[in-house]
């Protein structure tokens, strides 16, 4: 059984998932058909830049030139219109900048409404910009193979856009997927482009295809579901995670803890703290503070994000995961450097987590 003292912190708000995309309105670049367009990726300290259009990776071709932080489109056509993004990958994090490209003969004046805030929709479904379906968030779709323990809930997502707004339907093994095809049926969240199956059983194994369509086109995406029989064991944590990290004062840092657990896991992020100048309580046990834990109000508990760090944030961070069978924990160290000192690659420190057991 774990034994430690917890410092109460009732003011702790549940962490929001880190925002990895810009929060201001996307810039719109307008070009007439046949014109050339050049856009500069407005991100700082970009070591590696990757580009996407409508969520799909964009590579160079005979009309698209990618040079450093610049994207050039030669002889633009209406098909080049869409939501573009450049992502800068850095050592500590990655950041994405979005912008719109509109290749059209007529320069649209936008809504007639007196919107003085300048906030326009990314895509105005009521406008005349008719558009075939497209994926809006391919990150949510990258994991095609889902191996899920029996009795768990499975969710497949196909976030899409288009004008008019497309409809979504689901196929199982290439055929229409009907409610009566599985005991307990399934749920569809059209507003989140998702299919949800609760309490899966081996007969749910198969290929699930979302078909998203409107009058201008159709796209589809297939997931493979494998349902594995339960084999109870305590949580398994991926070796090497969380990894040691270093950042400067005022910087941001993320610790990741990859968990495999057949039974429902409970994740806690814990840090040693001092109380009344002491690291240990009267019972000789260390003071520990739960920074984040899985639950209704906490999304993505496997990630602990620290923003605007101070020297006081330095120290050991423990990822503790438990289920009804047992528990496991691994830890990493955060080094906070003064502003003038650039963070380098941290030498691996092997931390023994035994004291938590």
């Amino acid at each position: 059984r774990p034994s430690f003292s917890l410092v109460e912190d009732t003011t702790l708000e549940p962490e929001e998932p880190p925002t990895k995309y810009q929060i201001s309105q996307p810039e719109v670049y307008v070009a007439a058909p046949g014109e050339s367009l050049e856009v500069r990726c407005l991100l700082k300290d970009a070591a590696v830049i990757s580009w996407t259009k409508d969520g799909v990776h964009l590579g160079p071709n005979n009309r698209t030139v990618l040079i450093g932080e610049y994207l050039q489109i030669k002889g633009a056509t209406p098909r080049d219109s869409g939501l573009y993004a450049c992502t800068a990958s850095r050592t500590v994090d990655s950041e994405t900048w979005y912008f719109m490209v509109n290749v059209t003969d007529a320069i649209s004046s936008g809504d007639d409404e007196d919107d003085t805030d300048g906030a326009e929709d990314f895509v105005s479904e009521n406008s005349n910009n008719k558009r075939a379906p497209y994926w809006t968030n391919t990150e949510k779709m990258e994991k095609r193979l889902h191996a899920v323990p029996a009795a768990n809930t499975v969710k497949f997502r196909c976030p899409a856009g288009g004008n008019p707004m497309p409809t979504m339907r689901w196929l199982k093994n290439g055929k229409e997927f009907k409610q009566e095809h599985r005991i307990g049926g399934y749920k569809v969240r059209n507003q989140h482009w998702s299919l949800i199956m609760e309490s899966v059983v081996p007969s749910d194994k198969g290929n699930y295809t979302c078909v998203v369509e409107n009058e201008y086109g159709s796209i589809n995406h297939t997931y493979h579901l494998d349902v594995v029989e339960r084999s109870p064991h305590r949580p398994i944590l991926q070796a090497g995670l969380p990894a040691n990290a270093s950042t400067v004062v005022g910087g941001d840092v993320e610790f990741v803890c990859k968990v495999y657990s057949d039974a429902q896991p409970h994740i806690q992020w814990i840090k040693h703290v001092e109380k009344n100048g002491s690291k240990y309580g009267p019972d000789g046990l260390p003071y520990l503070k739960v920074l984040k834990h899985s639950g209704i109000n906490s999304s993505n508990a496997e990630v602990l994000a620290l923003f605007n760090v101070t020297e006081a944030d330095a120290g050991e961070y423990i990822c503790k995961v438990s289920n009804y069978i047992g528990q496991a924990n691994q830890s990493a160290w955060l080094t906070v450097l003064p502003k003038q000192q650039a963070p380098g690659r941290e030498k691996e420190i092997t931390a023994s987590p035994d004291y938590l057991e």
């Epitope: 708000e13 929001e16 929709d121 990314f122 479904e125 809006t136 409809t167 969240r189 507003q191």
Partner: antibody, heavy 123, light 107 residues
Amino acid sequence: EVQLVESGGGLVKPGGSLRLSCAASGFTFSSYALSWVRQAPGKGLEWVGRIRSRIEGGTTDYAAPVRGRFTISRDDSKNTLYLQMNSLKTEDTAVYYCARDRSPSDSSAFAIWGQGTLVTVSS
Amino acid sequence: SYELTQPLSVSVALGQTARITCSGDNLGSQYVDWYQQKPGQAPVLVIYDDNDRPSGIPERFSGSNSGNTATLTISRAQAGDEADYYCQSWDSLSVVFGGGTKLTVLG
């Protein structure tokens, strides 16, 4: 504290326009879909429309009675949601609430509500 | 258009169990959420995704949804539970609310 605060309500003549604002605080505004819900005096709740988060495309959906007359927009840099109401009718008289989805992408339930702002359409 | 039907009113004796129904065509294939609204106040989410409770909502509140009917169950009813209750689901990309049920706690 997670909070939504509506403003901009008031008395307006039929055919007129009004713009409501909803200021958010205490959460990462840009991550969430947001809706407007209204409630006529002594009546039930009626959904007006919603706007998705930027990462979900930032697109909007509207209820049939307001489609073409109302426009929902958001300014993530100001943590503010807007409802532009044009061609107002007497039946648009209601308390207007802004509401936030329970989680950024997994739930459609409205977990956070503002206190509401009253819009009265009368000649 | 899709409709959710609720009884106008439901009465329950103090300490007893109240059940409020919400019916709609093939409602079991959609998730249903429930809201409590007291006079002069904004609605409060009490059940989401058919049967999940937000933090701070007592265990006395529970939900179920299958076939064409969703049910909100309030066990050991208290005077403070007296309020209007609304079910909510979706019709494609539109939110749909039930007409609301006034719960009266007797005694």
